[in-house]
Interface confidence: medium
C-alpha cells in the first residue's frame, strides 16, 4: 500500500505570451497521494469549472484559454490539495500580445486655413504600437508646426494651404504593422480681396468699370452693393481662374454712390465675406462731400429728434474728437438763435439745419453723407426765410455774428445737387413739400437772383406727405 | 475726480412712493446726459430711466413708464428718480450714471456706489 | 421684444485671449448700437471698459478692445490677469418706437 504524500507541483508555472483570439495553455503538474483536488485563479478569484471560455483537463494539471481577449492577461495560480499537509501553489503571468489595431481610424477633415486640426489615430496594441503618418505617397516629417501626439493622433498647428493632401496613419509593434484608409485634409481659405475697386471722380452721364478681385477655398461668390442696396443698373462679368474671382461692374453714372464688392464663400454652415468699396463722385458737385470724412450712424439726439426720420443713418463728421456731441451742441446752439426768427422760417430753418448737419448717410468702407437737395436750401433761403437770412449774410459780413447759425456752415445753396438731375442723389426736407402746399402767399423777396433760379419744388407725392416720421409743426 | 453720490433709498411697501437723488460733482453737471440703471439682488443690469443734458426730453424702460420720472436740476448739479406705484420686482440697487455726453443714451461712463430700494410688505 | 444677448459664462487661463460677445435675439449688432462694454465685479458699481463699439475708456488698459464681429459685438481681453475675473455687461441703444438702452444678461468671466 502506498503512503500518503503531500503535493509537490514539480513543474511550477511560467509566463505564457499569447496574442489574442489564439490558444493560451498553463501546466501545473503535481506528484501527490492521494490524486490532489488543483483549483485555478486568476488575480486571485477563482475560475469557475463550468466557465466555457476555459478547458481544465489532465485532472486539473492543465489550463486552457481557448480564445484569448486583450482582457484576460494577468497572474494565473494553480492551488493543489490532498489533505496531506498543506495546499501548495505555483503562479505564472498571461502576458496578451496584440498585433497593432488602429481603433479610432482618421476622418475627412475640412478646416479653415490658419486653425488647428487633429486628426485622430487610437490604436491598441502589446507591445504598445508607434504611429507614424503618411502624406501622399511619402513619410510625414514632423515640425514646430506638425506634431504626432501621444495618443497617435496627427495635430497640425495654423493650417496652411499646402497641408491638404490624402494622410494614413501606420501603426506598428514587433508583431506587425496597421495601416488606417487614407483621408483626405481639405483646407479652406476666407474669402479675401486680392485687388479692390478703385474710386472714380468723373462727369455726369461718363460710363465707369468697377473691378474687384476675389480669392478663397471654395472659390468666393461676388456681390455688389450700390448706396447699402443691390445694384440696381449696370452690367456684371465675371471669370474665374486658379480659385481667383474677377468680377466687373460697368455703370453709366447719373449720380454718386458708394460701390461695395462683397466676396463670399462657404464653410460648412458659416459664411465668410471680405468687403472693398469705391465711390464714384461726379465732378461737378464732389469737392464739397470728398473732404468730409466720419461714419454713419443713427441719430440719438434731441436737438433733431422730432425733423429726422427716425430709424435713418446720419452722417458724423470725424474732423471732431466726438463727432455726435459737437454735432448736438452747434445744433443746440443755432436752435437758440432760431427762438428770434419768424414763425414761418423757424420750422423750415430748422428742418434745413438739421437735415444740412446731420446729412443722411450711405453707409459702407467710405461713409458717404447726401447733401440737401439745391431747390430746398433755395426755398428755405428766399422763400421760408429771406427777410432773416439777408440780415444773417448781412451781419456775417460785418462781422457781427458770432453764433447760432454762423457757426454753423450753412449750406451754400448753389454748390447743393438738383433733384431735377437726380433725384436720388440729395436730400429732400419733407416739411417743405407739405408746408408749400398749405401757404397761399409768400412774402415777397428782394433777390439778386433771376426769379428762374427760385425753386420749382415738386408737387407732393405720398412718399412726402405728412408722415409719423417727420414733426410738422 | 467724478463722484455721483445717490440717497434716498429703502425700504417701502408696494404701492408706496420713494425719491432718489444724485448729487453730482467733479464735472460740468449741466453739460452731460445722466441715467438711472438697477440692478435686483443676484440679477444683470437694467436700464432705468435717462435724461439729456438740458432735461427737455425723458426716456423710460417699459415697465417703468407712467410710474417712475426722472427729473435734474442744473443749478444744484442733482438728478432725482421719483418713484410711485412701487412693485416688488423694483427691489433692487439703483446707480446713478452720467453719460459721455450731451445726448441721453451716450456710454455710461462714471457710476455711483448705488443705494438699495426695497419693496417688501 | 428683442433681447441683448451674451454667453452665460466662460473661462480663461492666465495670459490667454477671450472673446465675449453680445448679440441681438433677431437681428444684427451694428455700429448704431452703439456698444458699449461694462465690467463688474461682486459688490462693486460698474466700470466702463469699451463705448460706442470699439473706443477705450481713459484709464482701461489696451489689452481691452472692442469691435463687431460678423453679427455681434464682441470685447476681446488679451493677456487675461486674475483680476480681469468678472461679470462683463454690454448695453445697446436701440431704437424700435421709442429710445431704449438695453443691456445684455451678463458674463461671468473666470481666469483659472
Known amino acids: 500500500e502506498k503512503l500518503p504524500k503531500a503535493p509537490v507541483i514539480t513543474t511550477p508555472l511560467e509566463t505564457v505570451d499569447a496574442l489574442v483570439e489564439e490558444v493560451a495553455t498553463f501546466m501545473c503538474a503535481v506528484e501527490s497521494y492521494p490524486q490532489p483536488e488543483i483549483s485555478w485563479t486568476r488575480n486571485k478569484i477563482l475560475i469557475k469549472l463550468f466557465d466555457t471560455r476555459y478547458s481544465i483537463r489532465e485532472n486539473g494539471q492543465l489550463l486552457t484559454i481557448l480564445s484569448v481577449e486583450d482582457s484576460d492577461d494577468g497572474i494565473y495560480c494553480c492551488i493543489a490539495n490532498n489533505g496531506v499537509g498543506g495546499a501548495v501553489e505555483s503562479c505564472g503571468a498571461l502576458q496578451v500580445k496584440m498585433k497593432p489595431k488602429i481603433t479610432r481610424p482618421p476622418i475627412n477633415v475640412k478646416i479653415i486655413e490658419g486653425l488647428k486640426a487633429v486628426l485622430p489615430c487610437t490604436t491598441m496594441g502589446n507591445p504598445k504600437p508607434s504611429v507614424s503618418w503618411i502624406k501622399g505617397d511619402n513619410a510625414l516629417r514632423e515640425n514646430s508646426r506638425i506634431a504626432v501626439l501621444e495618443s497617435g493622433s496627427l495635430r497640425i498647428h495654423n493650417v496652411q494651404k499646402e497641408d491638404a493632401g490624402q494622410y494614413r496613419c501606420v501603426a506598428k509593434n514587433s508583431l506587425g504593422t496597421a495601416y488606417s484608409k487614407l483621408v483626405k485634409l481639405e483646407v479652406e481659405v476666407f474669402a479675401r480681396i486680392l485687388r479692390a475697386p478703385e474710386s472714380h471722380n468723373v462727369t455726369f452721364g461718363s460710363f465707369v468699370t468697377l473691378r474687384c478681385t476675389a480669392i478663397g477655398i471654395p472659390v468666393p461668390t461676388i456681390s455688389w452693393i450700390e448706396n447699402g442696396n443691390a445694384v440696381s443698373s449696370g452690367s456684371i462679368q465675371e471669370s474665374v481662374k486658379d480659385r481667383v474671382i474677377d468680377s466687373r461692374l460697368q455703370l453709366f453714372i447719373t449720380k454718386p454712390g458708394l460701390y461695395t464688392c462683397i466676396a463670399t464663400n462657404k464653410h460648412g454652415e458659416k459664411f465668410s465675406t471680405a468687403k472693398a468699396a469705391a465711390t464714384v463722385s461726379i465732378a461737378e458737385w464732389s469737392k464739397s462731400q470728398k473732404d468730409s470724412q466720419g461714419y454713419c450712424a443713427q441719430y440719438r439726439g434731441e436737438v433733431c429728434d422730432a425733423v429726422l426720420a427716425k430709424d435713418a443713418l446720419v452722417f458724423f463728421n470725424t474732423s471732431y474728437r466726438d463727432p455726435e456731441d459737437a454735432q448736438e451742441l452747434l445744433i443746440h446752439t443755432a436752435w437758440n438763435e432760431l427762438k428770434a426768427v419768424s414763425p414761418l422760417c423757424r420750422p423750415a430753418a430748422e428742418a434745413l439745419l438739421c437735415n444740412h448737419l446731420f446729412q443722411e448717410c450711405s453707409p459702407g468702407v467710405v461713409p458717404t453723407p447726401m447733401p440737401i437737395c439745391r431747390e430746398y436750401c433755395l426755398a428755405v433761403k428766399e422763400l421760408f426765410c429771406a427777410k432773416e437770412w439777408q440780415a444773417m449774410e448781412g451781419k456775417a459780413h460785418r462781422g457781427l455774428y458770432r453764433s447760432g447759425m454762423h457757426l454753423l456752415p450753412v449750406p451754400e445753396c448753389s454748390k447743393l445737387p438738383s433733384m431735377h438731375r437726380d433725384p436720388t442723389a440729395c436730400t429732400r426736407l419733407p416739411y417743405l413739400d407739405y408746408k408749400k402746399e398749405n401757404i397761399t402767399t409768400f412774402p415777397s423777396i428782394t433777390s439778386s437772383r433771376p426769379s428762374a433760379d427760385i425753386p420749382n419744388l415738386p408737387a407732393s407725392t405720398s412718399s412726402f406727405a405728412v408722415s409719423p416720421a417727420y414733426s410738422m409743426t | 475726480e467724478v463722484q455721483l453720490l445717490e440717497s434716498g433709498g429703502g425700504l417701502v411697501q408696494p404701492g408706496g412712493s420713494l425719491r432718489l437723488s444724485c448729487a453730482a460733482s467733479g464735472f460740468t453737471f449741466s453739460d452731460y446726459g445722466m441715467s438711472w440703471v438697477r440692478q435686483a439682488p443676484g440679477k444683470g443690469l437694467e436700464w432705468v430711466s435717462a435724461?439729456?443734458?438740458?432735461?427737455?426730453?425723458?426716456y423710460y424702460k417699459e415697465s417703468v413708464k407712467g410710474r417712475f420720472t426722472i427729473s435734474r436740476d442744473n443749478s444744484k448739479n442733482t438728478l432725482y428718480l421719483q418713484m410711485n406705484s412701487l412693485r416688488a420686482e423694483d427691489t433692487a440697487v439703483y446707480y446713478c450714471?452720467?453719460?459721455?455726453?450731451?445726448?441721453?443714451?451716450?456710454?455710461?461712463?462714471?457710476w455711483g456706489q448705488g443705494t438699495l430700494v426695497t419693496v417688501s410688505s | 421684444q428683442t433681447v441683448v444677448t451674451q454667453e452665460p459664462s466662460f473661462s480663461v487661463s492666465p495670459g490667454g485671449t477671450v472673446t465675449l460677445t453680445c448679440g441681438l435675439s433677431?437681428?444684427?449688432?451694428?455700429?448704431?448700437?452703439?456698444p458699449d462694454w461694462y465690467q463688474q465685479t461682486p459688490g462693486q458699481a460698474p466700470r466702463t471698459l469699451i463705448y460706442?463699439?470699439?473706443s477705450r475708456h481713459s484709464g482701461v488698459p489696451d489689452r481691452f478692445s472692442g469691435s463687431i464681429l460678423g453679427n455681434k459685438a464682441a470685447l476681446t481681453i488679451t493677456g487675461a490677469q486674475a483680476d480681469d475675473e468678472s461679470d462683463y455687461y454690454c448695453g445697446l441703444y436701440m431704437y424700435s418706437g421709442s429710445k431704449n438702452y438695453v443691456f445684455g444678461g451678463g458674463t461671468k468671466l473666470t481666469v483659472l
Open positions: 435724461i439729456p443734458w438740458q432735461g427737455g426730453s425723458t
Open positions: 433677431s437681428g444684427s449688432v451694428t455700429s448704431s448700437n452703439y
Open positions: 450714471a452720467k453719460r459721455s455726453g450731451r445726448i441721453a443714451f451716450g456710454a455710461l461712463d462714471a
Open positions: 460706442s463699439t470699439d
